[in-house]
Interface confidence: low
């Protein structure tokens, strides 16, 4: 199987030789976005409902501290790149750590200047790889010389960087947040009044993957016949996940007898018709 991975992408910008304050950052867990950095609030925030649901507030405090430190580091590095000319420039760092099926680990970071890769580092062996271009060679020399002047940038520092990344990855995996292939649906049930004492109840499932889902109305625990229900197509929602709905008409006052049954990737749930007008129910996001 593909390894579990934690990836951070940070970027700092300079305008006319002046390095801008702040930075851009995002985090991916097993390829899924789980973190974004809010530049206005200067805080790491969950990206996606599943990250918000499972990871506690402490996670975002820790991530904010770490990203702030990394962002400052990257800003300092950008000030030492001698290649600076007028206009807008960017320095980007992508940091990845992986845990493989055989429990072996990998760690690396990659630096891009104006979108061009100029240095890759193996965090475990401290080996560096520099592309052949003269520009990449010059940039890499600039940066590594600057790091050599920094007493903090020792082999121990890089090992700690890798250990810290792996520690987080293991913690996030234990939290059950690493959705490798399955994204459970959000389910909500709504009622709309129609004439003659009948109401239409609609059960909507959204943001799920894979596409296969069972969504059906039950009366007193028994599935309604197909001809009494109307199904929407299972459609992509533009985020790599899917959405669908099922509706049926019931007698007003009999709401308590009806439930929406959802089954998806081995998980299932039953959602009652709300006594008010709208009720949003969220499926437990489990792996």
């Amino acid at each position: 199987a593909e390894p579990h991975s934690l990836r951070y992408n940070l970027m700092v910008l300079s305008q006319d030789e002046s390095v801008q304050s702040g930075f851009l950052a995002e985090g991916h867990l097993d390829g899924q976005p789980f973190l974004r950095y809010d530049r206005q609030k200067r805080r790491a925030k969950p990206q996606g409902q599943w990250a918000e649901d499972v990871l506690g507030a402490k996670t975002w405090d820790t991530e904010t501290e770490d990203l702030t430190e990394n962002g400052q580091d990257l800003r300092r590095t950008l000030t030492h790149i001698k290649d600076q000319k007028g206009g807008l420039h960017s320095l980007q760092e992508i940091r990845v750590c992986e845990i493989h099926e055989d429990s072996s680990t990998r760690g690396s970071r990659h630096f891009y200047y104006d979108g061009e890769l100029f240095l890759s580092q193996n965090l475990e062996t401290q080996e560096s790889t520099v592309p052949q271009s003269s520009r990449a060679q010059t940039l890499a020399m600039n940066v590594t010389n600057f790091w050599k002047e920094d007493a903090m940038k020792t082999k121990t520092h890089y090992r700690a960087m890798q250990a810290d990344c792996l520690q987080k990855l293991q913690r996030y995996l234990k939290s059950g947040v690493a959705i490798r292939r399955t994204v459970p649906p959000m389910v909500n049930v709504t009622c709309s009044e129609v004439s003659e004492g009948n109401i239409t109840v609609t059960c909507r499932a959204s943001s799920f993957y894979p596409r296969n889902i069972t969504l059906t109305w039950r009366q007193d625990g028994v599935s309604l016949s197909h001809n009494t229900q109307q199904w929407g197509d299972v459609l992509p929602d533009g985020n790599g996940t899917y959405q669908t709905w099922v509706a049926t008409r019931i007698r007003q006052g009999e709401e308590q007898r009806f439930t929406c049954y959802m089954e998806h990737s081995g998980n299932h749930g039953t959602h009652p018709v709300p006594s008010g007008k709208v009720l949003v129910l969220q499926s437990q996001r489990t792996d």
């Epitope: 593909e2 992408n9 995002e26 292939r181 993957y209 894979p210 985020n239 790599g240």
Partner: antibody
Framework: EVQLVQSGAEVKKPGESLKISCKGS????????IGWVRQMPGKGLEWLGI????????RYSPSFQGQVTISADKSISTAYLQWSSLKASDTAIYYC????????????WGQGTLVTVSS | EIVLTQSPATLSLSPGERATLSCRAS??????LAWFQQKPGQAPRLLIY???NRATGIPARFSGSGSGTDFTLTISSLEPEDFAVYYC?????????FGQGTKVEIK
């Protein structure tokens, strides 16, 4: 309508460099991976690698690591496949294709770019 | 990397007949297997993903089954436009790999 439009056919000499493109439209380009697939004359499909245009994170098939470079410019919704020094064995049709965030297989494909390398 | 072996290499059938194509993986790929159709001069088209899910707009005569190492694509009744090359592809392990293809030709 989702579309991937690739650049036209190329005829090159061995040792020359080349960059072919794939422009996405009709969807959020930064939300989906773009992959590249090779098909040599009369042969099957081979996976080269993939890029996430949102942050240009790339992964290569080990067979093609170091042989090609995959890049993207999200400002113009375009992905690229390039060679610094072409070989006759690079002669093939190259397809770009879109893969969803949740790792769904390639659901939309470009029309293909024929690259011919001959002295 | 995972090797996918498709059989038979060529399948000669008449319109209206049932086609059964096989794809075997060198190790388990769970259900992360897709099937693509390719006609001459065209790009491949996704038919089936995750072993048994039909892609959008694919006719019901196409169905997929299997999990682990053995997978089958079935075309219940061949239409003239179904004569093409079919590839399986796994995405369980990196790198994703394709089978060598099965050509379905008119008998």
């Amino acid at each position: 309508e989702v579309q991937l439009v690739q650049s036209g056919a190329e005829v090159k000499k061995p040792g020359e460099s080349l960059k072919i493109s794939c422009k996405g439209s009709g969807y959020s380009f930064t939300n989906y991976w773009i992959g590249w697939v090779r098909q040599m004359p009369g042969k099957g499909l081979e996976w080269l690698g993939i890029i996430h245009p949102g942050d240009s994170y790339t992964r290569y098939s080990p067979s093609f690591q170091g042989q090609v470079t995959i890049s993207a410019d999200k400002s113009i919704s375009t992905a690229y496949l390039q060679w610094s020094s072409l070989k006759a064995s690079d002669t093939a049709i190259y397809y770009c294709a879109r893969e969803g965030i949740a790792a769904t297989p390639f659901d939309y494909w470009g029309q293909g770019t024929l690259v011919t390398v001959s002295s | 990397e995972i090797v996918l072996t498709q059989s038979p290499a060529t399948l000669s059938l008449s319109p209206g007949e049932r086609a059964t194509l096989s794809c075997r993986a060198s190790q388990s790929v769970s259900s992360y297997l897709a099937w693509f159709q390719q006609k001459p001069g065209q790009a491949p088209r996704l038919l089936i993903y995750d072993a048994s899910n039909r892609a959008t707009g694919i006719p019901a005569r196409f169905s997929g089954s299997g999990s682990g190492t053995d997978f089958t694509l079935t075309i219940s009744s061949l239409e003239p436009e179904d004569f093409a090359v079919y590839y399986c592809q796994q995405r369980s392990n990196w790198p994703p790999t394709f089978g060598q293809g099965t050509k379905v030709e008119i008998k």
